[in-house]
Interface confidence: low
């Protein structure tokens, strides 16, 4: 019988404690906000926001400029000064709660916690492969804004999501803000509303519309903005929020809101309840039928899937996906199963789902006792009635107000319970090659590069590595710019390859030869590694 | 400061087609939609429609019957209310009105034009 | 449609006095969304375009003069004029923008005793 050599154990051919330093930057505070830009002519840069404070960074990670974005009231505020003499409100720090690009200007805006939750639009001006930021412009009028009615009060001190779409020459901000009692009644900004930035940039267009949480609610009912994106014809939120307004407003669930990216109307807005499960291959005894809910979004993503991972999920190759990861409750504290969870929403099912729901609404003969939902926003109805009345008037259409439609929709865990006791705080999602691969930030501070597969009983690391010595939690929001990815942890911004930040963590030549080809690794006489690692002995033909 | 002109008197026969235009200055056209309103000789007001004219977009008042067609040209600022198959009892005057405009379809009207008085007879 | 139903039909005072005019609605006009009532009034003088008093039912529009107040919640509502000028006698008319179509009262007309 011939003698074979003995089978390394698969995680015994890779060490995560291998440490690897990836290019940082010390932004002097917590990071509150970070958003990239990439020009037509090859300037890009990295925008940080901390409490007082913008910084612009070039691609390298390097200061460019600094801006002073508070304390309101202070002398030294930069942006407040664009505002003209004050006061302008009570004095006060300067969070940022919300900075986009503009990309049609293109500009950077940033809205902050201070001054009613006004913002500053900075138009961009290349320099070299830098950028830098122009003098502000206040996006208030104040001659348009009253407290119960303020166009230009965008950002809620509770948080706020912004998209930014172009429709024709203009720009409209797809605004969701988290409300209480407090922040509704001081120049009150809307839970979901759609504004236009004035040419002039003197601020935002006054009627525009919005949907709040009403007054009798705002103690009880409370949203929280998880993450917003545009695709297609259509703006999506992901929203935690109380399952009912009636019953204990801790039982939480997910839900996405869709309103058109075409028409800045409310009239088409839908909701639909995101269902993510963890359903363990082999059920142990009084486990829940269908698998365990994991009810309440931590972070989430959409992108176009990898080959493999669209077969997996019965779609075409490049069609958008929304990932998200999921938690048991609030604290995302141990329970039985995993602490995470992944799970994946084809945006075309979703559409879907939410047309079909429209048609049970409208269409007849509709289901007696089906209700259009959204109790918090609006008066209770029944479908097909709009909202607080008993009947459709002939020149009303059922489809002209907003609707919760009455199904949700039902995944489960992509990594078969396999992220264990990992808990994920940040998510981006990118196609390399055919392979999908999930970019996660950690609770402690790690990085976790994965590639989304359903099928397997182990996790396809790219990698698995610490940013730094901090342990801080990664941030959820993460930018791209060009090939890497920026993280943000503590006070540090990082910057991480999107192909993995080298191959050394592979410790057999074998498993160092398998690694995905966009990882660029190969053997180098003792360790795996990238060829201008060693240049001399690197190949990636065969194993000695 | 914000201005509604409408323009000057008409003379029509039944069966015919009138076109009354309200040019806007003082304000951003697409900021606001515009509505147009009937007063009959000694009578009250009557709601004819509205536009936006962001996207163009009319809501007829049914009573009107489809007679009533709502334009926006928004290269000059000028909204247009055209109403068809003319009778005597459509001599009246007719205003346009920018409204403010909300979610529920809230809309008041804070600017007037000064009225086109259209006349119908034999 | 909501139909807008105004009294008197013609108010006889003499300036100096307080008015008060009524508008009833066939459906509530408080709309839950916000808690404001959809309620628009306006007056009317001989040969001019209407004019914008009060909005939301309350909220004086901009060059209004204080002597001028709205009030009311759901179908029932009052402008007042607590001390009637000489040019306040005109035609009032009260506007609903709940819902399409929008719909004016047939008016009160404000005459001098």
């Known amino acids: 019988e011939d003698w074979q050599c003995p089978r390394t154990p698969y995680a015994a051919s890779r060490d995560f404690d291998v440490k690897y330093v990836v290019p940082s930057f010390s932004a002097g505070g917590l990071v509150q906000a970070m958003v990239t830009y990439e020009g037509d002519r090859n300037e890009s840069a990295v925008f940080v926001a901390i409490r007082n404070r913008l910084h612009v960074l070039g691609p390298d990670l390097k200061s460019v400029q600094s801006l002073a974005t508070g304390p309101a009231g202070d002398p030294g505020c930069q942006t407040c000064a664009a505002c003209g003499p004050g006061p302008h409100g009570p004095p006060g720090d300067t969070d940022t709660k919300v900075l986009v690009l503009d990309p049609a200007l293109p500009a950077l805006v940033s809205c902050g916690s201070s001054l009613q939750g006004r913002c500053f639009l900075h138009d961009l001006e290349p320099q070299g492969t830098a950028v830098h930021l122009a003098a502000p412009a206040c996006l208030f009028s104040a001659h348009h804004n009253r407290p119960d009615d303020c166009p230009d009060c965008v950002a809620s001190p509770l948080g706020t999501r912004v998209t930014v779409v172009e429709q024709g020459q203009a720009s409209y901000f797809y605004v969701a803000s988290s409300l209480d009692a407090a922040v509704a009644a001081s120049f009150s900004p809307r839970s979901v509303s759609i504004r236009r930035l004035k040419a002039d940039a003197s601020g935002f267009a006054p009627g525009f519309v919005a949907l709040s949480v009403l007054p009798k609610h705002l103690v009880s009912y409370s949203i929280e903005y998880v993450h917003s994106f545009h695709t297609g014809a259509f703006v999506y939120f992901l929203t935690v929020q109380p399952a009912s307004v009636t019953d204990d407003p801790s039982a939480l669930h997910t839900r996405l809101a869709r309103l058109s990216a075409t028409e800045p109307e409310l009239g088409d807005y839908r909701e639909l309840v995101l269902d993510c499960r963890f359903a363990p291959k082999r059920r142990r005894r009084g486990a829940p039928e269908g698998g365990q809910p994991y009810p309440v979004l931590r972070v989430a993503h959409s992108a176009p899937v990898g080959a493999q991972l669209a077969t997996e999920l019965s779609i075409a190759e490049g069609q958008e996906v929304l990932f998200g990861v999921f938690v048991t409750g609030k604290d995302g504290g141990p329970g039985v199963g995993p602490n995470s969870v992944v799970c994946a929403f084809p945006i075309d099912l979703l559409d879907t789902l939410i047309d079909e729901g429209v048609e049970r609404c409208c269409e007849s003969p509709v289901h007696p006792g089906l209700r259009r939902g959204l109790d918090f926003f609006q008066s209770p109805s029944f479908c097909p009635n709009p909202p607080g009345l008993e009947a459709l008037s002939p020149n009303t259409s059922c489809r002209h107000f907003p609707l919760l439609v009455s199904s949700s929709f039902s995944r489960v865990d992509l990594f078969n319970g396999l992220l264990g006791p990992v808990q994920v705080t940040a998510l981006y999602v990118t196609r390399l090659d055919n392979v999908t691969v999930a970019h996660m930030g950690t609770m402690d501070g790690r990085i976790l590069q994965v590639e989304l597969v359903r099928s397997l009983n182990y996790l396809l690391y790219v990698s698995n590595f610490s940013l730094g010595d901090s342990g801080q939690p990664v941030q959820r929001d993460v930018s791209r710019l060009g090939d890497h990815l920026l993280f943000a942890s503590g006070d540090q911004v990082f910057q991480v390859p999107i192909q993995g930040p080298g191959c050394r963590h592979f410790l057999t030549c074998g498993r160092c030869l398998r690694a995905w080809h966009f990882m660029g690794c190969g053997w180098c006489g003792n360790m795996c590694g990238q060829q201008k690692e060693c240049p001399g002995s690197w190949q990636q033909d065969h194993c000695p | 400061q914000v201005q509604l002109v409408q323009s000057g008197a008409e003379v029509k026969k039944p069966g015919a087609t009138v076109k009354i235009s309200c040019k806007v200055s003082?304000?951003?056209?697409?900021?606001?939609?515009m509505d147009w309103v009937q007063q009959a000789p000694g009578k009250g007001l009557e709601w004819m429609g509205d536009?936006?004219?962001?996207?163009?977009?009319?809501i007829y008042n049914q009573k009107f019957k489809g007679r009533v067609t709502i334009t926006a040209d928004t290269s000059t600022d000028t909204a247009y209310m055209e109403l068809s198959s003319l009778r005597s009892e459509d001599t009246a005057v007719y205003y346009c009105?920018?409204?403010?405009?909300?979610?529920?379809?809230?809309?008041?009207?804070?600017?007037w034009g000064q009225g086109t008085l259209v006349t119908v007879s034999r | 449609e909501i139909v807008m139903t105004q009294s008197p039909g013609t108010l006889s005072l003499s300036p100096g006095e307080r008015a008060t005019l009524s508008c009833k609605s066939s459906?509530?006009?408080?709309?839950?969304?916000?808690?404001?009532?959809?309620l628009a009034w306006y007056q009317q003088k001989p040969g001019q375009a209407p004019r914008l008093l009060i909005y939301?039912?309350?909220t004086r529009a901009s060059g209004i003069p204080d002597r001028f107040s709205g009030s009311g919640s759901g179908t029932d509502f009052t402008l007042t004029i607590s001390r009637l000028e000489p040019e306040d006698f005109a035609v009032y008319y009260c506007?609903?923008?709940?819902?399409?179509?929008?719909?004016f009262g047939q008016g009160t007309k404000l005459e001098i005793k």
């Open positions: 459906q509530s006009l408080l709309f839950s969304g916000n808690q404001k009532n959809y």
């Open positions: 506007q609903q923008y709940y819902s399409f179509p929008r719909t």
């Open positions: 939301w039912a309350s």
């Open positions: 003082g304000y951003t056209f697409t900021d606001y939609h």
């Open positions: 536009i936006n004219p962001n996207n163009g977009g009319a």
């Open positions: 009105a920018r409204s403010h405009y909300d979610y529920a379809g809230g809309a008041w009207f804070a600017y």
